[in-house]
Amino acid sequence: STGASSHCQKTSLRVNFEDIGWDSWIIAPKEYDAYECKGGCFFPLADDVTPTKHAIVQTLVHLKFPTKVGKACCVPTKLSPISILYKDDMGVPTLKYHYEGMSVAECGCR
Amino acid sequence: STGASSHCQKTSLRVNFEDIGWDSWIIAPKEYDAYECKGGCFFPLADDVTPTKHAIVQTLVHLKFPTKVGKACCVPTKLSPISILYKDDMGVPTLKYHYEGMSVAECGCR
């Protein structure tokens, strides 16, 4: 998601499962840090935002035609799992140590 | 990149290498379609935008706290190569049939 004037980076995003209605099936944790990718993808794209060639091209086109083409976007490029205790289809509390794709590990410009 | 009210989709983006200063080393093609990912990632995220769990979580948090958290972003999720003729370090015209990551194959919400 886009941010103010800071460059693309990972920031904390505390998520409470009750707020998103997932407390009906996720028993634990009550909340976790999903993290969020915030900030702009400005020219020149730094190595730490691991830009694809397409992101570099789009950034250059945006520089030339800012009203025609948007900037590349700061998004999660690598996700991490979390451990959860959830109710399965039979209502049995079940532990899952690697519930994939729930937390941002790395952000980049895409 | 973000769009108006349409949902996340792939749109044409003709790129002229002269416009971005790459004509100094890319001899052919003169231009190509890089495509662009445009549009919003609105709730509920459809299957065709192949949302990650994190994107779904972020969308739900945005729904609850729209000023605190941004929407997921519409970005390339799969890229395609193009063929290029370029000048190598020796200045020799060189054909590369798979110059990776230059064109959008698929867009999604991340």
């Epitope: - | 190598d88 020799v92 060189t94």
Partner: antibody, heavy 114, light 107 residues
Framework: QVQLVQSGAEVKKPGASVKVSCKAS????????MNWVRQAPGQGLEWMGW????????NYAQKFQGRVTMTRDTSISTAYMELSRLRSEDTAVYYC???????WGQGTLVTVSS | DIQMTQSPSSLSASVGDRVTITCRAS??????LAWYQQKPGKAPKLLIY???NLQSGVPSRFSGSGSGTDFTLTISSLQPEDFAVYYC?????????FGQGTKVEIK
């Protein structure tokens, strides 16, 4: 200077195989694909395929799929083109040519005759 | 495969003439087009690459133009050493194809 030197003329019987070599010098062999092109007597140019000398991956013209094999030996900067199940129509001059066809070998005449 | 059609298939011209050979691709090939000259018993020689770029060492009387499907090779003032067969070639598709050739003869 940059050059490609091919092996000598060959006479083969129908059904046999021929292997033509192409030795590169004056440049880094692994930096450029090697193409093979043939030309039947009095006819035009026909592209057969290429080999990437780094990984050895190949791309063959549909017409020659299953009959042509392109290989390379990077230690001696040499590319090879082997054509099997020869027929009289394969009588031609066979050329190797560097990536963008800027440098060509001198050609190897392969005659297929019973 | 992409078909490359050259015209004319042969032409007669005199020294000093301006000669134009055309090449049409069966589908768009951007500017992935090359022109070659071939003399009897010799390997082809690259004249023009990427439709309009003159290969190093080639005389400036040779020029190329075009993009998409229609291309032209022009010899501004034909010289005695220019009598040969000329081929166009597309390198846009991974299956490379040549035109059938244009023979330039002395009138």
């Amino acid at each position: 200077q940059v050059q490609l030197v091919q092996s000598g003329a060959e006479v083969k019987k129908p059904g046999a195989s021929v292997k033509v070599s192409c030795k590169a010098s004056g440049y880094t062999f692994t930096s450029y694909y090697m193409n093979w092109v043939r030309q039947a007597p009095g006819q035009g140019l026909e592209w057969m395929g290429w080999i990437n000398p780094v990984q050895g991956n190949t791309n063959y013209a549909q017409k020659f799929q299953g009959r042509v094999t392109m290989t390379r030996d990077t230690s001696i900067s040499t590319a090879y083109m082997e054509l099997s199940r020869l027929r009289s129509e394969d009588t031609a001059v066979y050329y190797c040519a560097r990536n963008y066809f800027d440098v060509w070998g001198q050609g190897t005449l392969v005659t297929v005759s019973s | 495969d992409i078909q490359m059609t050259q015209s004319p298939s042969s032409l007669s011209a005199s020294v000093g003439d301006r000669v134009t050979i055309t090449c049409r691709a069966s589908q768009t090939i951007s500017n992935f087009l090359a022109w070659y000259q071939q003399k009897p018993g010799k390997a082809p020689k690259l004249l023009i690459y990427a439709a309009s770029n003159l290969q190093s060492g080639v005389p400036s009387r040779f020029s190329g133009s075009g993009s998409g499907t229609d291309f032209t090779l022009t010899i501004s003032s034909l010289q005695p050493e220019d009598f040969a067969v000329y081929y166009c070639q597309q390198l846009y598709a991974e299956s490379i194809t040549f035109g059938q050739g244009t023979k330039v003869e002395i009138k």
